[in-house]
Amino acid sequence: APISSHCRLDKSNFQQPYITNRTFMLAKEASLADNNTDVRLIGEKLFHGVSMSERCYLMKQVLNFTLEEVLFPQSDRFQPYMQEVVPFLARLSNRLSTCHIEGDDLHIQRNVQKLKDTVKKLGESGEIKAIGELDLLFMSLRNACI
């Protein structure tokens, strides 16, 4: 089970209208450049077999991957939203740095790995798709971690 006190974000992180709006605008803009509507990254397959109490840890993994492998490499695109949203998400990642789970997390890593593999397989269009799903990432973090 998670060390739940560390797998928590204050709800105030998700109640800032400006940065919430910028996050959703970034997702919307990227989704207009995403032509692959058949593939979904954040959805029931990601959460399958993961208990509610483990989902913040799961979303921490997805957030870190998205920052390191998607947003940082694409940081020159989708301005001005990107330059505001990336630091916001990086702060959330930092606040979740002590979120761990005790025991076996293989089922979680398996689900996250499938997401990573999908993004990598699609190449740049996978990265665009991940940016286009930042609204879902935001909502998933909020639902799982507050």
């Epitope: 959703f24 997702a27 207009l32 058949d38 959805g43 399958h48 109490s53 909502m139 639902n143 507050i146």
Partner: antibody, heavy 119, light 108 residues
Framework: EVQLVQSGAEVKKPGASVKVSCQAS????????IHWVRQTPGQGFEWMGW????????RYAQKFQGWVTMTRDMSNTTAYMELPRLRDDDTAVYYC????????????WGQGTLVTVSS | QSVLTQPPSVSVAPGKTATITCGGN??????VHWYQQRPGQAPVLVIY???DRPSGIPERFSGSRSGNTATLTISRVEAGDEADFYC???????????FGGGTKLTVL
């Protein structure tokens, strides 16, 4: 079999309150959000909010914020929706439904509870 | 504010194919779900994520999407398919699900 079973029909006077229950079975109750959605002939479907059975956390539609209360009892795997200060236009069929992520399709619905508000 | 538009009614002869559309402004990156509601009953999920079918739903039910229009297709229509059909998306900007107004399918 996965199912959500709701309490029976209610007739209430304006100004009264109603509490509808939704008992879950056949799956791990804590792993799915329970949403409440009402349906009226004029307005169609109207989402009211959800409760996270694992934490008791809630998220309400703006219209129902400060009005509706959604709770759950883990011991009997039941979610509740309480609506005080009923008005005539709250007459509707109230459904509970589950979803996995908080923003996914409602894959299982309760059978519905008709709440009639009439003086 | 995103609004989902469905035709109020669709009529089809048994054995033929029924198509029900759902139009929405800017749901390019939204996932569209479809529910069937028979008279006096609760809705049943028949298609999710645009085109996926839950277990137990006949293969005759399929979904697709092109641009801002999603389509539910029911092939080899049977009398028992007569019901109201609703499309739904989760609107992240208002953080709530939006439902179409419903389409009444009549089997002639």
């Amino acid at each position: 079999e996965v199912q959500l079973v709701q309490s029976g029909a209610e007739v209430k006077k304006p100004g009264a309150s109603v509490k509808v229950s939704c008992q879950a079975s056949g799956y791990t109750f804590s792993d799915y959000y329970i949403h409440w959605v009402r349906q009226t002939p004029g307005q169609g479907f109207e989402w009211m909010g959800w409760v996270n059975p694992d934490t008791g956390g809630t998220r309400y539609a703006q219209k129902f914020q400060g009005w509706v209360t959604m709770t759950r009892d883990m011991s009997n795997t039941t979610a509740y929706m309480e609506l005080p200060r009923l008005r005539d236009d709250d007459t509707a069929v109230y459904y509970c439904a589950r979803d996995l992520t908080g923003f996914d399709p409602f894959d299982i619905w309760g059978q519905g509870t008709l709440v009639t508000v009439s003086s | 504010q995103s609004v989902l538009t469905q035709p109020p009614s669709v009529s089809v002869a048994p054995g033929k194919t029924a198509t029900i559309t759902c139009g929405g402004n800017n749901f390019r990156n939204k996932r569209v779900h479809w529910y069937q509601q028979r008279p006096g009953q609760a809705p049943v999920l028949v298609i999710y994520y645009d085109s996926d079918r839950p277990s137990g739903i006949p293969e005759r039910f399929s979904g697709s999407r092109s641009g801002n229009t999603a389509t539910l297709t029911i092939s080899r229509v049977e009398a028992g398919d007569e019901a109201d059909f609703y499309c739904q998306v989760w609107d992240s900007s208002t953080d709530r699900p939006l439902f179409g107004g419903g389409t009444k399918l009549t089997v002639l």
